[in-house]
C-alpha cells in the first residue's frame, strides 16, 4: 500500500503502561516538532480480545484520552474501580495528531491487569501486642470487586531481634495472630500480599511492608511473681 500522505508526524516514543495496585496509567514521551506553533495532541484507542478498536473517551472508558496534549492517560483517574476490567485482555494503541496530520499508530503488547499488576504492600497495618503474641490487622493493597475471580492472601515475615527470619502464611484473613512468641521480647515483622487469580495458575507477589518492631507483653504469671 502507498504511504499515507497525512501520516507524516513522528510517532510517540516509549509508551509504558503502569499497573500498580488498582492504577492503570498509559504514558509516553512527547513528540517534539521544531517548526510548529500548535501543540501536538494525542489519541488513545483500546480493544478487547475480539472487539473493534474504541477511542478512549468519556463514553467508552470514563476518561477523555483523545485530542489531549498531556503525555499520559490515567484510565483510573475517575475512581479506583474505573478503568479496564481486571480480568480482560486489553490492547492499547496511541498516535500523535496535528491538524490533518497524524503519526502511525504505536500498538502496545496486550495486558491483563491481574496477570501483569505490581502489587503494593498491605496498608494501614496495626499491631496489638499480647502475651507471647502479636495480632496484626491491615487492609488489602486494593479492592477486588469479585473475590470469586481473584483474591489476596497474606504472609508475615517475622523475627526476634537478632534472630532467624520466619515466614507464616498463607492467610486469607486481614487479621493475623502470631502466637507462640516469647513474652517481653522484641519482634520485627513485614507483611506481604499475594494476588491469586482463578483464571491463571500464576500468582503475583506484592511488595513487603516497611519493617516495624513490637515488644510482646510480659507473661501474666511472670508479672505476678514480681
Amino acid at each position: 500500500a502507498p504511504p499515507d500522505p497525512l501520516s507524516q508526524l513522528p510517532a510517540p516514543q516509549h509508551p509504558k503502561i503502569r499497573l500498580y495496585n488498582a492504577e492503570q496509567v498509559l504514558s509516553w514521551e512527547p513528540v517534539a516538532l521544531s517548526n510548529s506553533t500548535r501543540p501536538v495532541v494525542y489519541q488513545v484507542q483500546f480493544k478487547y480480545t475480539d472487539s473493534k478498536w474504541f477511542t478512549a473517551d468519556i463514553m467508552s472508558i470514563g476518561v477523555n484520552c483523545t485530542q489531549i496534549t498531556a503525555t499520559e492517560c490515567d484510565f483510573t483517574a475517575a475512581s479506583p474501580s474505573a478503568g479496564f476490567p481486571m480480568d480482560f485482555n486489553v490492547t492499547l494503541r496511541l498516535r500523535a495528531e496535528l491538524g490533518a496530520l497524524h503519526s502511525a499508530w504505536v500498538t502496545m503488547p496486550w495486558f491483563q491487569h491481574y496477570r501483569n499488576v505490581t502489587v503494593g504492600p498491605p496498608e494501614n497495618i496495626e499491631v496489638t501486642p499480647g502475651e507471647g503474641s502479636l495480632i496484626i490487622r491491615f487492609s488489602s493493597p486494593f479492592d477486588i470487586a469479585d473475590t470469586s475471580t481473584a483474591f489476596f492472601c497474606y504472609y508475615v515475615h517475622y523475627w526476634e531481634k537478632g534472630g532467624i527470619q520466619q515466614v507464616k502464611g498463607p492467610f486469607r484473613s486481614n487479621s493475623i495472630s502470631l502466637d507462640n512468641l516469647k513474652p517481653s521480647r522484641v519482634y520485627c515483622l513485614q507483611v506481604q500480599a499475594q494476588l491469586l487469580w482463578n483464571k491463571s495458575n500464576i500468582f503475583r507477589v506484592g511488595h513487603l511492608s516497611n519493617i516495624s518492631c513490637y515488644e510482646t507483653m510480659a507473661d501474666a504469671s511472670t508479672e505476678l511473681q514480681q
Partner: nanobody, 111 residues
Framework: QVQLQESGGGLVQAGGSLRLSCAAS????????MAWYRQAPGKQRELVAT??????WYADSVEGRFTVSRNNAKNTMYLHMNSLKPEDTAVYYC??????NGQGTQVTVSS
C-alpha cells in the same frame, strides 16, 4: 502446635528432578492451605507455590516445572521439581498458617 518438617533435598544435575516432602506432626492436621518458599544465599525469600485446596498457584520462574501434591493419609505435602536449573539452588521451606515452620531442606543444582 503442629510442627512441619521438610526433607528430600540434595545435589542434582541441571535437568534433573527431586521430590521434596513437607510432613506435619499431628494426626489431625490436613493441608488445606500451605505454601512453599525458598531462600538462596544473599537473596530475598521467594514464594514458589501456594496451595488453597483444591487449587495451586505457582511463581513465573517455576510454572510448568514444579507441581504440588498432597497425601492426607500421610499428613504430607510434596513439591515435585522437574527440569531443575542452577538458579533453583536454595533452601526450601514449607509453611502453613496453623503450624510451626521446619528447618528447610537444601537443594543444590549443579551445571
Amino acid at each position: 502446635q503442629v510442627q512441619l518438617q521438610e526433607s528430600g533435598g540434595g545435589l542434582v544435575q541441571a535437568g534433573g528432578s527431586l521430590r521434596l516432602s513437607c510432613a506435619a506432626s499431628g494426626s489431625t492436621f490436613t493441608f488445606s492451605t500451605m505454601a512453599w518458599y525458598r531462600q538462596a544465599p544473599g537473596k530475598q525469600r521467594e514464594l514458589v507455590a501456594t496451595f488453597f485446596s483444591p487449587s495451586t498457584w505457582y511463581a513465573d520462574s517455576v510454572e510448568g516445572r514444579f507441581t504440588v501434591s498432597r497425601n492426607n493419609a500421610k499428613n504430607t505435602m510434596y513439591l515435585h521439581m522437574n527440569s531443575l536449573k542452577p538458579e533453583d539452588t536454595a533452601v526450601y521451606y514449607c509453611t502453613s498458617p496453623s503450624a510451626s515452620n521446619g528447618q528447610g531442606t537444601q537443594v543444590t543444582v549443579s551445571s
